[in-house]
Interface confidence: low
């Protein structure tokens, strides 16, 4: 708390200017009109204010709106909103997507702050719903957010917003979500031709049936283990060895050490020793020779 | 068909070295993955390391840092490094590779590390 003292003769700030930078904290407090400071926001970002210079602003303006500042702030706030906590964005009422930008940009390079994520929230929440423009703009500054995302909210993402997803920002995302924006990458890219099509859609592979990857594997994508360990293990377990080492091309080589690991280890126990040795990568555990396969899941559908 | 001659074997000290080579009787420029596989007596047939066409290089752990694979397309030729041999090195090393899911195997060359 900034002990309330009189303003000195002659320094009443009669406007938010450079000038202010030489004020202590007192005077700044003592000086500065809360009303005036509101009113010129958009300047405070131009001027070299310390760390605890921006204190005593937000200090005036906390007291002068006790319930949560007006859009008209918000939006101008630039700088001044890292110094805002998430119970302090709670009171506030976000609805121009103009406003979001403007703080967007302000934590802009770096990740997504408590009072980002506090901020998104009560915009979205303020709107309704999960419009494209909202949508084109949170994932042109997070694409990690899709992740944070439930299935069922995602399911109103258009796929022209995944153009603006980079393979990292799917890290995040379980097979669930991945089941979702699988289809809408399919969408997004459907008109790039077969090699750059693979590099945009593989970071959506988590999320793809049997027959893409199937498709997949006649298109010479040599597709990386890493990749491949994050397929749903249901869309891999019909694929046959040539199939998976089409998929994989020279990455084939890494089953080896994924062999006790899903979906590696599940695929290996539906093939037929005889096709996996033609891999010649040593990979036990397949059917033997000679043994009947039966497909217990149509055995049940018939019954 | 491809055949797989490999040569370089023989006994060495442990903490010693020797370079094994495969040679192919047809172009590996073409075949995509060359691989080393080791034998102990009485053991399962291991696999030791592996070498994709565009060079991209597998190590099992229990050689990494110690054995280094390569390849010399213009020799038809795979090679395996073997350093700081130990007692448990010894076995026989075979030559392997995958063409047109043919599986094609050296005869192998003996390795015995011991003092």
């Known amino acids: 708390e900034v002990e309330k003292t009189a303003c000195p003769s002659g320094k009443k700030a009669r406007e938010i200017d450079e000038s202010l930078i030489f004020y202590k904290k007192w005077e700044l407090e003592a000086c500065v009109d809360a009303a005036l400071l509101a009113t010129q926001m958009d300047r405070v970002n131009a001027i070299p204010f310390t760390y605890e210079q921006l204190d005593v602003l937000k200090h005036k303006l906390d007291e002068l709106y006790p319930q949560g500042y007006p859009e008209s702030v918000i939006q101008h706030l630039g700088y001044l909103f890292l110094k805002m906590s998430p119970e302090d964005i709670r009171k506030w009422n976000v609805t121009s997507l103009e406003t979001l930008k403007a703080l967007l940009e302000v934590n802009k390079g770096h990740e997504m702050s408590p009072q980002v994520a506090t901020l998104i929230d009560r915009f979205v929440k303020g709107r309704g719903q999960l419009d494209k423009d909202t949508l084109d703009t949170l994932t042109a500054f997070y694409p990690g957010y899709l992740c944070s995302l439930s299935p069922e909210e995602l399911s109103s993402v258009p796929p022209s917003s995944i153009w603006a997803v980079r393979p990292q920002d799917l890290d995040t995302c379980d097979p669930r979500q991945l089941d979702v924006l699988y289809p809408k990458a399919r969408l997004a890219f459907q008109n790039m031709n077969g090699s750059e099509y693979f590099v945009k859609i593989q970071s959506f592979l988590g999320g793809a049936p049997t027959e893409d990857l199937k498709a997949l594997s006649q298109q010479n994508v040599s597709m990386d283990l890493a990749t491949f360990m994050k397929l749903r293990t249901d869309a891999v377990l019909p694929l046959t060895v040539a199939e998976v080492q089409k998929l994989l091309g020279p990455h084939v080589e890494g089953l080896k050490a994924e062999e006790r690991h899903r979906p590696v280890r599940d695929w290996i126990l539906r093939q037929r020793q005889d096709d996996l040795d033609t891999l010649g990568l040593g990979l036990q555990g397949g059917i033997p020779n000679g043994y009947l396969v039966l497909d217990l899941s149509m055995q049940e559908a018939l019954s | 068909q491809v055949q797989l001659v490999e040569s370089g074997g023989g006994l060495v000290q442990p903490g010693g070295s020797l370079r094994l080579s495969c040679a192919a009787s047809?172009?590996?420029?073409?075949?995509?993955?060359m691989r080393w596989y080791r034998q102990a007596p009485g053991k399962q047939r291991e696999y030791i390391a592996g070498m994709t066409s565009d060079g991209t290089t597998y190590y099992a752990d229990s050689v990494k840092g110690r054995f280094t694979i390569s390849r010399d397309n213009s020799k038809n030729t795979l090679y395996l490094q073997m350093n700081s041999l130990r007692a448990e090195d010894t076995a026989v090393y075979y030559c392997?590779?995958?063409?047109?899911?043919?599986?094609?195997w050296g005869q192998g060359t003996q390795v015995t590390v011991s003092s």
């Open positions: 047809t172009s590996i420029f073409s075949i995509g993955t």
């Open positions: 392997n590779t995958v063409a047109h899911f043919q599986n094609y």
